[in-house]
Interface confidence: low
């Protein structure tokens, strides 16, 4: 998870039991009961935007204290503000909770820029617009932080949904989702639909608008179109996957596929951008520049530092190429591709000086820690984190921003040989996810 370029989720609805289930479609493979169908009480339970994260409403303690919590598939700690901070409207007050238990242990989490530190404990946690259950979960009470909370983001904590291997201070601290599955009958799966607005949202618009859905324990058919295609989770730490090919407007980048996954490729709702390893980023930008050469953009734009604006309603989407990532499929020698549009990788931003214009940042950036499929990818798709079957599913999101001519796509199968060789084997050192 890369803070600052990472996302939030928020919900503001009322909790109901795991609810209605539609009968399984006849052409689907058999699954555990209750995994698919309608999860009305969880649909639209997220708020936020890609630049500041998507957040869900949670309650902690007894009596319940309501907080907005960033949904982050790139980390594994449940951590909440627990002391006054200029950017927090509210925070977790442990002394007011009769069910709080102190673990008498500290936790320190540094990032490349910024950090947070706090005190570990456990308390009762529930998700009002999630399953109708309460669990005792580990909570890091953040007492000090630097460049972690975002002014105006409206979230007060972070829900790390990845695996225990990357939890801080170590993998013995059980992540929230593990606790949820252990203590309840909620199936070991969740799915995310992050809905990019396609245009800048001010503070009140974010609060009033739906940012998407986090379906806990299942898959909701209303949130996607077409079929779900699954890629294996390579290793249970981050949600690590293997990319086997990259195309820009159908043109293969023609790189050794190991480069695409150097040193890993992860799906991370807490990162704004599509982040690519240096060599891949350079090749991709060169190809995108060539495809969009009818207009010339400053170098600062391609570095994500400079806005490019067009007169309202005149953004030339058609000059920008689509980007396809081919992912290893579940079946041997089979891959599938996910395709995003410029509507995903050009991130709308409000430029005060030119508020009559539509302004964008290039939301593909360089990484030294592998490929990160952040919000710009996830906003195109409904993404199923099927932990029970160690796989991640992608389908075209019912809420993705597109135009009359092109749409995001998930297509397959494609015959692909020796895909395992595309994975990079990280030398065994104590690498931290949080140092990206």
């Amino acid at each position: 998870t890369q803070h600052g370029i990472r996302l939030p989720l928020r919900s503001g609805l009322g909790g109901a039991p795991l609810g209605l289930r539609l009968p399984r479609e006849t052409d689907e493979e058999p699954e555990e009961p209750g995994r698919r169908g309608s999860f009305v009480e969880m649909v639209d339970n997220l708020r936020g935007k890609s630049g500041q994260g998507y957040y869900v409403e949670m309650t902690v303690g007894s009596p319940p204290q309501t907080l907005n919590i960033l949904v982050d598939t790139g980390s594994s700690n449940f951590a909440v503000g627990a002391a006054p901070h200029p950017f927090l409207h509210r925070y977790y007050q442990r002394q007011l909770s009769s069910t709080y238990r102190d673990l008498r242990k500290g936790v320190y989490v540094p990032y490349t820029q910024g950090k947070w530190e706090g005190e570990l404990g456990t308390d009762l946690v529930s998700i009002p617009h999630g399953p109708n259950v309460t669990v005792r979960a580990n909570i890091a009470a953040i007492t000090e932080s630097d460049k972690f909370f975002i002014n105006g983001s409206n979230w007060e904590g972070i829900l790390g949904l990845a695996y225990a291997e990357i939890a801080r201070p170590d993998d013995s601290l059980e992540p929230f989702f593990d606790s949820l599955v252990k203590q309840t009958h909620v199936p070991n799966l969740f799915s995310l639909q992050l809905c990019g607005a396609g245009f800048p949202l001010n503070q009140s618009e974010v609060l009033a608008s739906v940012g998407g859905s986090m379906i806990i324990g299942g898959i909701d058919h209303s949130l996607y179109t077409g079929s779900l295609w699954y890629t294996p989770i390579r290793r249970e730490w981050y949600y690590e996957v293997i990319i086997v090919r990259v195309e820009i407007n159908g043109q293969d980048l023609k790189m050794d596929c190991k480069e695409y996954n150097y040193d890993k490729s992860i799906v991370d709702s807490g990162t704004t951008n599509l982040r690519l390893p240096k060599k891949v980023f350079e090749a991709a930008v060169k190809s995108i520049k060539a495809a969009s050469s009818t207009e010339k953009f400053p170098d600062g734009f391609w570095l994500g530092e400079q806005l490019v604006c067009w007169q309202a309603g005149t953004t030339p989407w058609n000059i920008f190429p689509v980007i396809s990532l081919y992912l290893m499929g579940e079946v041997t020698n089979q891959s599938f591709r996910i395709t995003i549009l410029p509507q995903q990788y050009l991130r709308p931003v409000e430029d005060v000086a030119t508020s009559q214009d539509d302004c964008y940042k290039f939301a593909i950036s360089q990484s030294s820690t592998g490929t990160v499929m952040g919000a710009v990818i996830m906003e195109g798709f409904y993404v199923v984190f099927d932990r029970a079957r160690k796989r991640i599913g992608f389908a075209v999101s019912a809420c993705h921003v597109h135009d009359e001519f092109r749409t995001a796509a998930v297509e397959g199968p494609f015959v692909t040989l020796d895909m395992e060789d595309c994975g990079y084997n990280i030398p065994q050192t104590d690498e931290s996810t949080l140092m990206t």
Epitope: A197, G198, F199, P200, A312, G313, T314, T315, W317, L341, Q343, P348, D358, V401, H402, D403, E404
Partner: nanobody
């Protein structure tokens, strides 16, 4: 809030013409889309035509291209749908809709993209 009022519906013989109007009142955004949709008995509501606030972008369903024209009069906050060469299959209730948003990649013929709807006006094409 925004109110939409359609008018101009009626009965006409095949090959005939009608002009529908949609008057918008209330608070209005500077960037918006107006669309015409229709719903025949037993069928889903479908997009017919749409226009952006500047009038620079128009979209039509394949079934009406070349026969229907959408236009607007910004001064009157009114959008028109000129329907020529009408066919029996054009029979439906016609709705005017407004999308008060700034989505650059807006999909104008999808009903789900629209925030505000009129009450509808009946168009019947029959000999």
């Amino acid at each position: 809030d925004v109110q939409l009022q359609e008018s101009g519906g009626g009965s006409v013989q095949p090959g005939g013409s009608l002009r529908l109007s949609c008057a918008a009142s209330g608070y209005f955004y500077s960037r918006w889309y107006m669309g015409w949709f229709r719903q025949a008995p037993g069928k889903e509501r479908e997009g017919v035509a749409a226009i952006n606030s500047g009038g620079s972008i128009t979209s039509y369903a394949d079934s009406v291209k070349g026969r229907f024209t959408i236009s607007q009069d910004n001064a009157k906050n009114t959008v028109y749908l000129q329907m020529n060469s009408l066919k029996p299959e054009d029979t439906a209730i016609y709705y005017c809709a407004a999308a008060l948003s700034r989505v650059p990649g807006f999909f104008p013929l999808f009903p789900s993209q629209y925030n505000y709807w009129g009450q509808g006006t009946q168009v019947t094409v029959s000999s």
